[in-house]
């Protein structure tokens, strides 16, 4: 059975040529992460293996950090960054587990944070 | 061209230590890892570890982390696997390999360790 | 991590036959499935990436298809020099490698 939940940043805005930072958490679970994989749209961005260690896709290599901790940082954004992004937790013995965060990159300086929230 | 030149077959004794090269032209070596993967005879293909030549970084699996030690020498654009205690069990072809992202693109040629007393 | 199993182990072929292979998941592999092909005493081959991407450089008599937790390799018309091991590697959940497939001369 899952008990795990997923929180995330939520739906997070920030400017053009700016960075930010991709956050999900795993909490209730006493399961073991074995993998996360960072997603856009049906795009792997960055995968962190519990053994081996983060691995970015090679698109992306100069915009995207790893971490801090499990989470991706996203440097230079462009508008076309505007979009869905997926946290994937692989566990054992769970299973997977999967967070959405919205982001959305504004032309002007208005950007800020939005709310976090949980998906069960 | 990409290559990547492996050192030649060795065959040891139980107890004692390999070690094992891997030579990269073709392309700027620091900038992609390196595994070690090896195959055992009738058995699936199993990732040893990865080093970064970049900052020397290195991960293992699990089953390695004791046993397996891997190098990288910058200056010669070399990676080296030292697999210590060997067993009869290590007995199988050890390759290196170029992951490229997330998948191996290039690999080398294979060196056969055999362990036998 | 997901466990692959490729079926079949041996296949035995003439040239010009259109040989299928395929590669199952323990569990859903989303497509970044890769296929490499071996020679005795060579170094393996990338032949198709996350799941339908040929290579560069690789004959379009080679074709890659699937979703899910199963996936195939295709050759359309086996040439001589197709005779080989194939195997499949997935990095949806660790990095785990199918045990291989065998084709040989009919």
């Known amino acids: 059975m899952m008990t795990g939940t997923i929180e995330t940043t939520g739906n997070i805005s920030a400017e053009k040529g700016g960075s930010i930072i991709l956050q999900c958490h795993l909490s209730s679970t006493t399961a073991q992460v074995t993998q996360v994989n960072w997603e856009q749209q049906d795009q792997l961005l960055a995968i962190c293996n519990a053994d081996l260690g983060w691995h970015i896709s090679p698109s992306f290599k100069d915009r995207v950090a790893p971490g801090p901790g499990l989470g991706l940082t996203l440097q230079s954004l462009t508008v076309n960054d505007t979009g869905e992004y997926f946290c994937i937790y692989h566990t054992y013995p769970d299973g997977t587990y999967t967070g959405r965060i919205f982001l959305e990159v504004l032309e002007s300086s208005v950007a800020e944070h939005g709310a976090r929230f949980q998906i069960p | 061209e990409v290559q990547l030149v492996q050192s030649g077959a060795e065959v040891k004794k139980p107890g004692a230590s390999v070690k094992v090269s891997c030579k990269a032209s073709?392309?700027?070596?620091?900038?992609?890892?390196i595994y070690w993967v090896r195959q055992a005879p009738g058995q699936r293909l199993e990732i040893i570890g990865r080093?970064?030549?970049?900052?020397?970084?290195?991960y293992y699996v699990d089953k390695f982390k004791n046993r397996a030690t891997i190098t990288a020498d910058t200056s010669a654009s070399t990676a080296y696997m030292e697999l210590s205690s060997l067993r009869s069990e290590d007995t199988a072809v050890y390759f290196c390999?170029?992951?490229?992202?997330?998948?191996?693109?290039?690999w080398g040629q294979g060196t056969l360790v055999t362990v036998s007393s | 991590d997901i466990q692959l199993t490729q079926s079949p182990s041996f296949l035995s072929a003439s040239v010009g036959d259109r040989v299928t292979i395929t590669c199952k998941g323990s569990?859903?592999?989303?497509?970044?499935l890769v296929w490499y092909q071996q020679k005795p005493g060579k170094a393996p081959k990338l032949l198709i990436y996350?799941?339908?991407n040929l290579q560069s450089g690789i004959p379009s008599r080679f074709s890659g298809s699937g979703s899910g937790t199963e996936y195939t390799l295709t050759i359309s018309s086996l040439q001589p020099e197709d005779f080989a091991t194939y195997f499949c590697?997935?990095?949806?959940?660790?990095?785990?490698f199918g045990q291989g497939t065998k084709v040989e001369i009919k």
């Open positions: 390999t170029r992951i490229y992202g997330f998948y191996f693109d290039f």
């Open positions: 073709g392309y700027t070596f620091t900038e992609y890892s």
């Open positions: 080093i970064d030549p970049k900052n020397g970084r290195t």
């Open positions: 569990q859903n592999v989303n497509k970044y």
């Open positions: 996350n799941t339908d």
């Open positions: 590697y997935q990095y949806n959940n660790g990095f785990t």
